[in-house]
Interface confidence: medium
């Protein structure tokens, strides 16, 4: 027995790997972390690695747990433990020289860089208060917010965040569907264009005043977020050009010729005033209607008894109970109505401060032979972006049998955000009314300029003797086109046998926005299923796809490939494409050097290893040959003198031989021309228990032999004429196979060092 | 076939974080496909809470988004929940379930 | 988030009666709807996949029907053992969602 002992010699130099510098915020104090600034020393240990410092020129450098002390010398082990700080003052970009040291060697004139970032500070102005409507929408402004920043941010990259939504309306954007999802995000540029809306929407019970909020969070990275609370006040208070009316409800009233009606709160309604009383007090309050300027062709009665000036007044209450009536005094159609000033009125009919109001009612008087128009039902109007289409009547049209079609007249109450109406010979600018003749003449076109979603027309149609009737309209803006995007196949890890599809497999794009798209199975794959929750499915959507909801499994591990086709359909329209599927081997493939021209090499785990594929299945990976090499062949070889010479060709092989060292890759040269460099590659098929097959290709570099040069490999042969150089003569076998004793002349052998050198050289 | 096995506290104290793991036996957890956890508060619901899939994807409910994180540990075949800052209405029984198969539920209780 | 209203939310029922209940969901689901059944102080159990696919050993006396919205969980025959409480959950959207329950109870 002898022993060896090994001393340590320092005789490798330290490198410097990472050199990237310090962003940190202006005099702020940040460790300099070990991803910015790390060395690596193949025989020292990261606390011999010493960096010393001179005089930073923006800041100083500390320890934690020391930030008074500067320093002027760290290690590696200190970066790695995140206690080397750096503190800045000065310049905002700056640095410090540095060099670095194992004990033994140094390397100097190395700089790292510090860089400091102003702070950038966020602020909101305006009033954060909209004043709205009730029922109505209400863009935010700049008034209402307005979004800044000390750095002057472009507006577009100042994104408001809605963290709690409204409660009593919703907020959406004009350009975007305006009945889908509620908005999330918005930017202060879509504030200052007034495309952030609010909408109010209108509650079963009546009420003067109603307060919501929105929380929102405003960010634009670097800059801390700033949180925002927007107050809105919904009231009847306010003067609003869509909403004439300040009570709960003033529609009017139809009465036939001659006749009477009664007058309910469905046309006369004021309780919105009386819900400014708390409602404990309600019930002891009332709303008191005086009449101004009576009816010019009818009475007004209050149960039953008329009302004049000397009793011009009503109340709420009456209203409620069905007491108050309109009778028309014949004599004629003529428009009729009555002004009224209606206030609150307190217990005991006192009069007390609150919301008033004076208004007027109108009556419209009807000919007792006019028979009101009939709707017919309506197709939607369906056209693509950017195009006009005209209105037919399979979209508007009424049966009337006593009204020419000029006499129906139809008015938009709510337009969409799609587009607009236009009359041909009318201007360019949308209309707002327009007759049945203009619809039977093809002059009534719909201009599809605004976003790309469905959207409705809310109309009023009336023969001007009947009450207006509601109808409405709808538009749905097609694409002109959809295309499946299909930017990569879909790659399954072999271990795992299946894999997430995303919108690098599937994605639509249009002409518009990009639309919520549905798939279809329509050719399955062959060799597995698609699942959407782990479980078979035939359909899914893109949303689906973008949560990584449809996953692709193999259930057949018999192919390395698979593909199925899908068509999607998107608003109407659809495309169809074809998914690759393949699987990504788990093998681990050699990378390095070329590799000696006319030698064999051996063929092991530093080169192609399946091992962890082996652990993850537990069973031994087999790999074929489909391809290759070009120059050369792959052998399997005698491991010892005794077993019989020659080697075989191999085109199928095991992990395990691979492990044993039984193989080896002869390393052709090129033909028919100059001795260089040159490249070549083997394609193999891996195969393993449970999982689906993968072709993986080892490509590799090869060169003439240099007896001179280290390679990183274990060489089992090197060309004869090298051998002879090298005073070993040695003769190949009568397959032109090598002696399995032959090596490098200067072995480098392998990852495996020594051991691998005595192993590939001691086998006899 | 399948079997998951909750563990972990009883008992937590309040803004303190919960912690529970997910032992899977009879597969392993890079063979299903949505390994979640579940909570059911006395007497009402089922309540998802999130999930980490075969691949090491992550999603969660977004009314605890903030809160929890779900992760795993493929060498001892668990997955495992933490859900920070509790509450009393964080009292509950938490599940951890594939859909195909459900651990038996462990109580957690938030009290100090 | 997709809302799922179950109903009733409690029914009684005799031993050899039919069940039905349904599963309302606030959007379309495409069919991604799973029905669990769930014992006092168990873990629910998977009945019912993909709105009418039985799970492995589950009773036939169990079926799942519906589309768009609208889901029905039915026990043609109700037996001793399926007196509990059933969920339906989507997945057809994140968050997954389930229905606040359904409980059977012997008449």
């Known amino acids: 027995a002898f022993t060896v002992t090994v001393l340590p010699v320092n005789d490798q130099p330290p490198i410097l790997t990472t050199n990237t510098g310090l962003q940190m915020w202006e005099g702020a104090t940040a460790p300099i972390p070990a991803e910015a600034l790390r060395s690596t020393d193949g025989d020292s240990g990261s606390e011999d690695l010493v960096y010393t410092i001179e005089q930073p020129s923006n800041g100083r450098v500390v320890l934690r747990g020391a930030p008074g002390t500067e320093v002027r010398s760290f290690t590696q082990a200190q970066l790695d433990g995140g206690l080397v700080l750096f503190s800045h003052r000065g310049t905002l970009d700056g640095g410090f020289r540095f060099r670095l040291s194992d004990g033994e060697h140094t390397s100097p004139g190395h700089f790292f860089r510090v860089t400091a970032q102003k702070q950038v500070l966020l602020s909101l102005k305006g009033s954060q208060t909209l004043t709205v409507c009730p029922g109505s929408v209400q863009p935010l402004s700049s008034q209402t917010l307005r979004a800044s920043s000390s750095a002057g941010t472009d507006p577009q990259l100042l994104l408001y965040r809605v963290v709690r939504g409204p409660q009593l309306g919703r907020l959406f954007h004009a350009q975007q569907d305006s009945t889908g999802e509620a908005l999330v995000n918005f930017t202060q540029a879509e504030v200052y264009a007034g495309n952030i809306l609010y909408e109010h929407e209108m509650p079963p019970e009546p009420f003067w005043e109603a307060h919501d909020t929105l929380e929102l969070q405003l960010s634009s990275p670097p800059a801390r977020d700033v949180a925002a609370t927007l107050a809105v006040a919904v009231s009847f208070e306010a003067a609003c050009p869509q909403r004439p009316s300040h009570l709960w409800k003033n529609k009017g009233l139809w009465v036939p010729e001659g006749q009477r009606a009664r007058i309910t709160v469905a046309a006369l309604d004021a309780s919105n005033l009386l819900a400014s009383v708390p409602s404990p007090q309600r019930s002891e309050h009332d709303v008191l209607f005086q009449v101004t300027q009576f009816p010019s062709r009818g009475q007004l009665l209050v149960s039953e008894e008329p009302l004049h000036a000397g009793q011009p007044h009503f109340l709420q209450s009456q209203l409620a109970a069905g007491q108050l009536v309109y009778a028309h005094g014949g004599g004629g159609t003529q428009q009729d109505g009555f002004h009224f000033r209606a206030h609150l009125q307190g217990p005991a009919g006192a009069s007390v401060a609150g919301p008033q109001t004076s208004e007027a009612f109108a009556i419209t008087v009807r000919d007792v032979n006019e028979r009101p128009p009939q709707p017919q039902a309506s197709v939607p109007l369906r056209l693509t972006r950017g195009s006009r289409a005209p209105i037919s009547r399979a979209q508007l049209s009424v049966v009337d049998p006593d009204s020419a079609p000029g006499e129906i007249e139809y008015e938009v109450q709510r337009a969409p955000h799609n587009g607009f109406l236009s009359l041909v010979g009318g201007g360019l600018g949308p209309v707002t009314r327009f007759t049945q003749a203009d619809v039977d003449s093809g002059r009534l076109a719909f201009v599809a300029n605004g976003s790309s979603v469905a959207g409705i027309f809310q109309l009023s149609m009336s023969d001007g003797a009947s009450p207006p009737l509601p109808m409405s309209l709808a538009v749905d803006i097609l694409p002109s086109a959809i295309e499946v995007q299909l930017r990569a196949p879909l790659e399954v890890p072999q271990a795992l046998g299946r894999s997430s599809l995303s919108q690098q497999q599937l994605r639509v794009v249009s002409d518009r926005e990009e639309p919520e798209a549905a798939y279809r199975l329509i050719q399955g794959p062959q060799y597995g299923h698609l699942l959407v929750g782990g479980r078979p499915t035939s359909a899914f959507s893109q949303f689906q796809i973008d949560q990584g909801e449809v996953v692709f499994a193999f259930t057949n591990f018999s192919s390395s490939h698979d593909h199925f086709r899908v068509l999607a359909l998107a608003r109407g329209v659809n495309a169809s494409a074809v998914v690759n599927v393949t699987v990504r081997a788990l093998l681990h493939v050699w990378a390095g050097g070329p590799w000696p021209q006319g030698a064999t090499l051996r063929l092991d785990p530093t080169v192609l290893d399946a091992g962890e594929l082996a652990n993850r299945t537990g069973s031994v990976p087999r790999f074929r040959l489909l391809e290759g090499p070009r120059h050369g062949r792959v052998v399997r070889v005698p491991r010892a003198r005794t077993e019989p010479g020659g080697s075989q060709l191999v085109e199928q092989f095991t992990q395990q031989d691979l492990e044993d060292g039984r193989l080896g890759l002869e390393v052709g040269r090129p033909e028919g021309r100059a001795p260089g460099p040159a490249g070549d590659s083997l394609t193999l098929e891996l195969w393993a228990q449970g999982v689906p097959p993968a072709v993986a290709s080892l490509d590799f570099a090869t060169e003439p032999y240099n007896a001179a040069r280290p390679y990183s490999v274990a060489l089992l042969s090197v060309p004869e004429a090298a051998r002879t150089e090298a005073g070993k003569p040695e003769s190949s076998t009568p397959t032109g196979e090598p002696g399995p004793m032959a090596s490098s002349p200067e072995p480098a052998v392998a990852k495996g060092g020594f051991l691998s050198f005595l192993e590939a050289n001691m086998f006899s | 076939q399948v079997q998951l096995q909750e563990s972990g506290p009883g008992l937590v104290k309040p803004s303190q974080t919960l912690s529970l793991t997910c032992t899977v036996s009879?597969?392993?957890?890079?063979?299903?496909?949505?390994w979640n956890w579940i909570r059911q508060h006395p007497g009402k619901g089922l309540e998802w809470i999130g999930y980490?899939?075969?691949?090491?994807?992550?999603n969660y409910n977004p009314s605890l988004k903030s809160r929890v994180t779900i992760s795993r540990d493929t060498s001892k075949n668990q997955f495992s929940l933490k859900l920070s800052s509790v509450t009393a209405a964080d009292t509950a029984v938490y599940y951890c379930?594939?859909?195909?198969?459900w651990g038996q539920g462990t109580l957690v209780t938030v009290s100090s | 988030d997709i809302q799922m209203t179950q109903s009733p939310s409690s029914l009684s029922a005799s031993v050899g009666d039919r069940v039905t209940i349904t599963c309302r969901a606030s959007?379309?689901?495409?069919?991604?709807l799973n029905w669990y059944q769930q014992k006092p102080g168990k873990a629910p159990k998977l009945l019912i996949y993909?709105?009418?696919s039985l799970h492995s050993g589950v009773p036939s006396r169990f079926s799942g029907s519906g589309s768009g919205t609208d889901f029905t969980l039915t026990i043609s025959s109700l037996q001793p053992e399926d007196f509990a409480t059933y969920h339906c959950?989507?997945?057809?959207?994140?968050?997954?969602?389930f229905g606040q329950g359904t409980k059977v109870e012997i008449k």
């Open positions: 980490i899939t075969f691949d090491g994807r992550n």
């Open positions: 993909y709105t009418s």
């Open positions: 959007y379309g689901i495409r069919g991604y």
């Open positions: 009879g597969g392993s957890i890079t063979d299903g496909y949505y």
């Open positions: 379930a594939d859909f195909d198969y």
């Open positions: 959950q989507q997945y057809s959207a994140l968050p997954w969602t």
